[in-house]
C-alpha cells in the first residue's frame, strides 16, 4: 500500500511591525519537530495594514480596532481554525512610538493598551504589546538576516546570497531604515566596542558574538526630511524654499505647524514670519547631498572614531545587508544590482533628481505623488547616509547588499523578534538526531 | 529658576472673551508640554486644557470645548488660552502649569505651576 | 472621565504622627497617579509623581504607594507646617483631580 502523509505538523507565529508610516503583519510557519533548527521558520504572509503607523492615533484611539480588523481577519484565514488558539501575536512598536513617547509616556501608552486590547480579542495567544528599543530593532534585524542567511548553522547550506559566498560562516552586517530611525549592527573584527551601550553579546547555536549595534533615533528617512526642512527654513528669505531635494518643477506648501509636530525639529525650531511656505524643487543632487550633510555632526567624537553625532562606530567589517527602505528606496531607482558601483549610483541620482517633475510623473504614473516625490530625497540621503554618516566608501561599497526578501522571508527585526520570544534560537548547538520518521506511516 | 506667570484675568461679562497668557522663563519652552487648571473660589482643581510639546496633543475638558482655545508662541515662551462665550461657572483662579518629565519621557502631571490669575464671569 | 475620590474628606493629626490619605479611581489608571499640596493663598506644589516618586526638593516624609484604582499618599511624621489640602490627579486619562483633602495638624 501506498504511504499516506500524516497532517503536517506545523506552528505559526504572528508578529506586527508596529512602525512610524504603517504596521505591518507577518505571519511565520515552521515544522514543530524543528524549531530549534536554524532556518526552519518561513513567512507565509505579509499584510500591510491600511493607514498610517499607530503613533498617529493619539487623538483618536478608538479608530485603532477598526484600523487592525483587516490584517487580523486575514491571519484568521491563513491560519488553520485548529492552530488560532496556540499561536503566538507579537506587536512590537518601534521609532514612531518612541518619539511620541518622548513627548508623553501616557500617549504612547494609552495607544499600546488600545492596541492590546483590539489584539486580545482575536482567537489567538495574544503575547502583548510594547515599544521595542532600538538596541532591540538593531539586534533582531542582525539575527533574521543570519538566520535566514543559515549563518548560525554548521552544515553547509544549499543557497547562498551571493554567488562568492556560499560557505561563509561570517556573519553580515544589518543595514535597517526606518522612517523615524535606522540601526546599523554588525560584528567588528577584533574591535572593542568602545561604548558599552553599543555592545550586544551573544551565544547563538553554541557560538559566541560580540556585536555593535546604534538606533539612530530621528534618522529615519521620513524624520530626516523633516530635519531638513526645519533646518532650511531657517535661512529661507520668506516663504518660498528652494529645494535641492525636488524635483524641478515640483511645489508643495507646508504647514510650520507640521514642520515642528516631531521632537526631531526641536533643534531647529524658531519663529517664522508665516505660516506656511512653498517647497520649490530645484532637482540638484549635489547641493541636496550637501544639505543633507548639515543634519550629521562629525565635528565631535569622544571615541577612537564615530559615526556621526558622536556615537561610537567601529571599523566596518565584512558584508552587509541592508534592508527595509534602504532596499524599497533602491530597488524603486532601480540601484539594487550587485553590479551597480558606488560612483554609478551617484551617477544615476543626479540624472533622477534632475528630471523635471512632470516627466517624472509620467513616468511613475501608478506611483502615490507623496511618495513620488520623495524618491530623490530619500535616494540622496541613502547614500549621504552610509558614505558619511556609516563611512562606507566606493570600495566596500561592493559589500553591501540590498535586500528585500531572503528565501521568501522579508528582511526585517520581525523574524528575529519572534524566534527570541518563542526560545527558537537555541544558546547551544541543538545535538543532530536522524531524519524525523513520523512524516510517513 | 522655572517661572510661570500668567496675565490677562479681570471682570467680564457672561458670553463675552477674554484672553490669558502665560510668560515662561528659566527652562527650554519648547521641550515641555503645558497646561491650564482652573479652581473655582473654595472648591477643588479642575484640569482645563493641555497642549503637548511638539502639538502632537491638543485636549481640553469637557466643560469649555468649543469656547476655549490654549495655543502656545514657542518664540516668545508663552502660552495662551483664549476664552469665549463666558459663564458664570468659569469664575475661577486660572494656573498655567508645565508637564513633568518621566525621566526622558514626557508627562501628563504638573511639576510647575504659575501664582495664577483670577477670572470673574459676571454681569 | 475618570472620577478620583479621596478620603477622608478632612483629618486632624498630631504632630510627629502619620497622616493617611486614599485616592480611589473609578476606573485603572496604572501607575498614573500623582499628589499635590496647596497651601492657602497659594499654587498647588508636586508631591508625588507616578504613584511613588518624591518630586524635587520634597521632604522624605512624604510617600506614595499603590497601582491601578487604589493609591495611598503618607505623611510621616507630621510636621506643623503640614497643613494644607491634599489632591491627587491621574494622568490615565484627560487629567482629573480628586475633591480633596483638607489635613489640619492638632
Known amino acids: 500500500t501506498q504511504n499516506k502523509a500524516l497532517p503536517e505538523n506545523v506552528k505559526y507565529g504572528i508578529v506586527l511591525d508596529a512602525g512610524s508610516s504603517h504596521t505591518s503583519l507577518y505571519i511565520y510557519k515552521w515544522p514543530a519537530e524543528k524549531e530549534n533548527d536554524t532556518g526552519v521558520v518561513h513567512q507565509v504572509e505579509e499584510c500591510r495594514v491600511k493607514g498610517p503607523g499607530i503613533s498617529k492615533f493619539v487623538q483618536k484611539v478608538n479608530e485603532i480596532g477598526i484600523y487592525l480588523t483587516d490584517c487580523m481577519e486575514r491571519a484568521r484565514e491563513v491560519i488553520p481554525r485548529s492552530q488560532h488558539q496556540e499561536t503566538p501575536v507579537y506587536l512590537g512598536a518601534t521609532a514612531g512610538m518612541r518619539l511620541l513617547r518622548m513627548e508623553s509616556e501616557e500617549l504612547a501608552d494609552r495607544v499600546l493598551d488600545v492596541v492590546e486590547r483590539s489584539l486580545s480579542n482575536y482567537p489567538f495567544d495574544f503575547q502583548g504589546a510594547r515599544i521595542i528599543t532600538g538596541q532591540e530593532e538593531g539586534a533582531y534585524g542582525w539575527i533574521t538576516i543570519n538566520y535566514l542567511l543559515g549563518k548560525f548553522s554548521q552544515k553547509t547550506r544549499w543557497f547562498s546570497i551571493v554567488p562568492y559566498e556560499t560557505n561563509n560562516q561570517e556573519t553580515f552586517g544589518a543595514l535597517d531604515l526606518g522612517g523615524a530611525s535606522t540601526q546599523v549592527t554588525f560584528v567588528p573584527q577584533n574591535q572593542t566596542i568602545e561604548s558599552p551601550d553599543n555592545a550586544l553579546q551573544f551565544r547563538l547555536y553554541g557560538k559566541d558574538y560580540n556585536v555593535y549595534t546604534h538606533s539612530f533615533l530621528c534618522y529615519g528617512k521620513d524624520q530626516a526630511l523633516w530635519q531638513k526642512l526645519a533646518k532650511d527654513i531657517q535661512v529661507a528669505s520668506n516663504e518660498i524654499l528652494r529645494d535641492p531635494c525636488f524635483h524641478p518643477g515640483y511645489k508643495k506648501v507646508v504647514n510650520v505647524s507640521d514642520l515642528y509636530k516631531t521632537p526631531c525639529t526641536k533643534r531647529f525650531e524658531m519663529t517664522l514670519p508665516f505660516q506656511q511656505f512653498e517647497i520649490q524643487g530645484i532637482g540638484n543632487y549635489q547641493q541636496c547631498h550637501q544639505s543633507i550633510l548639515e543634519l550629521f555632526n562629525t565635528s565631535y567624537c569622544p571615541y577612537s572614531q564615530c559615526a556621526f553625532n558622536g556615537i561610537f562606530l567601529p571599523p566596518l567589517q565584512g558584508d552587509f545587508g541592508a534592508f527595509s527602505a534602504f532596499y524599497f528606496v533602491m530597488k524603486f531607482l532601480n540601484l539594487t544590482s550587485e553590479k551597480v558601483s558606488q560612483e554609478k549610483v551617484t551617477e544615476m541620482m543626479k540624472k533622477f533628481c534632475a528630471q523635471p517633475w512632470e516627466e517624472i510623473k509620467t513616468s511613475y504614473a501608478g506611483v502615490k505623488e507623496k511618495y513620488l516625490s520623495e524618491y530623490c530625497f530619500s535616494g540622496t540621503y541613502i547614500l549621504s547616509l552610509l558614505l558619511q554618516g556609516y563611512h562606507f566608501t566606493a570600495d566596500s561599497w561592493e559589500h553591501i547588499h540590498f535586500i528585500g526578501k531572503i528565501q521568501g522571508s522579508d528582511a526585517g527585526w520581525t523574524l528575529g523578534y519572534m524566534l527570541n520570544l518563542t526560545n527558537m534560537i537555541p544558546a547551544e548547538q541543538p545535538l543532530s538526531t536522524p531524519l524525523s520518521h513520523s512524516t510517513y506511516v | 529658576q522655572v517661572q510661570l506667570v500668567e496675565s490677562g484675568g479681570g471682570v467680564v461679562q457672561p458670553g463675552r472673551s477674554l484672553r490669558l497668557s502665560c510668560a515662561a522663563s528659566?527652562?527650554?519652552?519648547?521641550?515641555?508640554?503645558m497646561n491650564w487648571v482652573r479652581q473655582a473660589p473654595g472648591k477643588g482643581l479642575e484640569w482645563v486644557a493641555s497642549?503637548?510639546?511638539?502639538?502632537?496633543?491638543?485636549s481640553y475638558a469637557d466643560t469649555v470645548k468649543g469656547r476655549f482655545t490654549i495655543s502656545r508662541d514657542n518664540s516668545k515662551n508663552t502660552l495662551y488660552l483664549q476664552m469665549s462665550s463666558l459663564r458664570a461657572e468659569d469664575t475661577a483662579v486660572y494656573y498655567c502649569?508645565?508637564?513633568?518629565?518621566?525621566?526622558?519621557?514626557?508627562?501628563?502631571?504638573?511639576?510647575?505651576w504659575g501664582q495664577g490669575t483670577m477670572v470673574t464671569v459676571s454681569s | 472621565d475618570i472620577v478620583l475620590t479621596q478620603s477622608p474628606a478632612s483629618l486632624a493629626v498630631s504632630p510627629g504622627q502619620r497622616a493617611t490619605i486614599t485616592c480611589r479611581a473609578s476606573?485603572?489608571?496604572?501607575?498614573?497617579m500623582h499628589w499635590y499640596q496647596q497651601k492657602p493663598g497659594q499654587p498647588p506644589k508636586l508631591l508625588i509623581y507616578?504613584?511613588?516618586n518624591l518630586a524635587s526638593g520634597v521632604p522624605a516624609r512624604f510617600s506614595g504607594s499603590g497601582s491601578g484604582t487604589d493609591f495611598t499618599l503618607t505623611i510621616n511624621p507630621v510636621e506643623a507646617d503640614d497643613t494644607a489640602n491634599y489632591y491627587c490627579?491621574?494622568?490615565?486619562?484627560?487629567?482629573?483631580f480628586g475633591q480633596g483633602t483638607k489635613l489640619e495638624i492638632k
Open positions: 502649569a508645565r508637564h513633568g518629565r518621566y525621566g526622558g519621557y514626557g508627562g501628563f502631571y504638573f511639576d510647575y
Open positions: 476606573e485603572g489608571v496604572k501607575s498614573y
Open positions: 507616578k504613584a511613588s
Open positions: 528659566g527652562f527650554t519652552f519648547n521641550n515641555y508640554g
Open positions: 497642549f503637548s510639546s511638539s502639538s502632537t496633543y491638543i
Open positions: 490627579q491621574q494622568s490615565w486619562n484627560d487629567p482629573t
